[in-house]
Amino acid sequence: MMTGTIETTGNISAEKGGSIILQCHLSSTTAQVTQVNWEQQDQLLAICNADLGWHISPSFKDRVAPGPGLGLTLQSLTVNDTGEYFCIYHTYPDGTYTGRIFLEVLESSVAEHGARFQIP
């Protein structure tokens, strides 16, 4: 029986060119976390395996960093990074728990201010 719950950072926003930490936390279960997968939509970003450690998908190696903890850091954000992210906790014997985070990447405040306030 699955008794655990996933807590996530929910809906978050970050500036273009910046970085963001995606974090989830599994609570209310004594199940062993064997692996945590991070996905963007249906695309694998990274895996943190209890035994083997971190594996970052080759196509994201330049912009994804492991941690902190079981979280994931996205770097050099672009507006194309806007969307749903999923943390998938593989546990034994409970099964699989999934958490969802929505990230919105905004144009940087510098760019916004530059557009709004013209220097005479």
């Epitope: 062993q32 064997t34 692996q35 997968n37 996905e39 249906d42 694998l44 895996i47 395996n49 209890a50 035994d51 083997l52 594996h55 999923f86 998938i88 593989h90 034994y92 014997p93 099964g95 699989t96 999934t98």
Partner: antibody, heavy 119, light 108 residues
Framework: EVQLLESGGGLVQPGGSLRLSCAAS????????MSWVRQAPGKGLEWVSG????????YYADSVKGRFTISRDNSKNTLYLQMNSLRAEDTAVYYC????????????WGQGTLVTVSS | DIQMTQSPSSLSASVGDRVTITCRAG??????LNWYQQKPGKAPKLLIY???NLQSGVPSRFSGSGSGTDFTLTISSLQPEDFATYYC??????????FGGGTKVEIK
Amino acid sequence: EVQLLESGGGLVQPGGSLRLSCAASGFMFSDYAMSWVRQAPGKGLEWVSGISGSGGYTYYADSVKGRFTISRDNSKNTLYLQMNSLRAEDTAVYYCTRSWYYYYGMDVWGQGTLVTVSS
Amino acid sequence: DIQMTQSPSSLSASVGDRVTITCRAGQSIRSYLNWYQQKPGKAPKLLIYASSNLQSGVPSRFSGSGSGTDFTLTISSLQPEDFATYYCQQSYSTPLLTFGGGTKVEIK
């Protein structure tokens, strides 16, 4: 060449025991999770048990929990399956497989060893 | 356990035919679906991992698709060596893995 070679199968009476071995070669054994998958005669595939690369984590299908024990010796590049309290329904070909993070599937399989449980 | 249901259980086809095998999961497994080919008396062989990724060395006539609960394995032009049994397997509930019942592709 990457290879898995099972041994230890044979005929055993119900209630008896058997120990299967799987010798690995051609890859860094401790970097891979390993599993046992079985196939009863004329039937489909059934995952039986798995073990992490270090051997620190073990997992079992409900059908064998408490009767089978998976283990590995990374110094010998060998995977084991100790099968106790065997039943007729355990009759099958037992395959040893390797997985890298599971997400990528079971990419290497041994040739299998037949276990027959019969009186 | 996550139940995996394959259809059809068997099919007859001719060389050159386009063949489609489906696999349905009892709950959403996202894209955590692998396909294997098994020939009589031989061990299974990994064809496709994570729903649509072709395993190294597998001919491009094999392709996979799907997400959630419904998945498809397609052989674009059946070759003599493709007559075999095909199994789907979910890895969403890693480390507890389950297989579909298999689909036997026979010569018409």
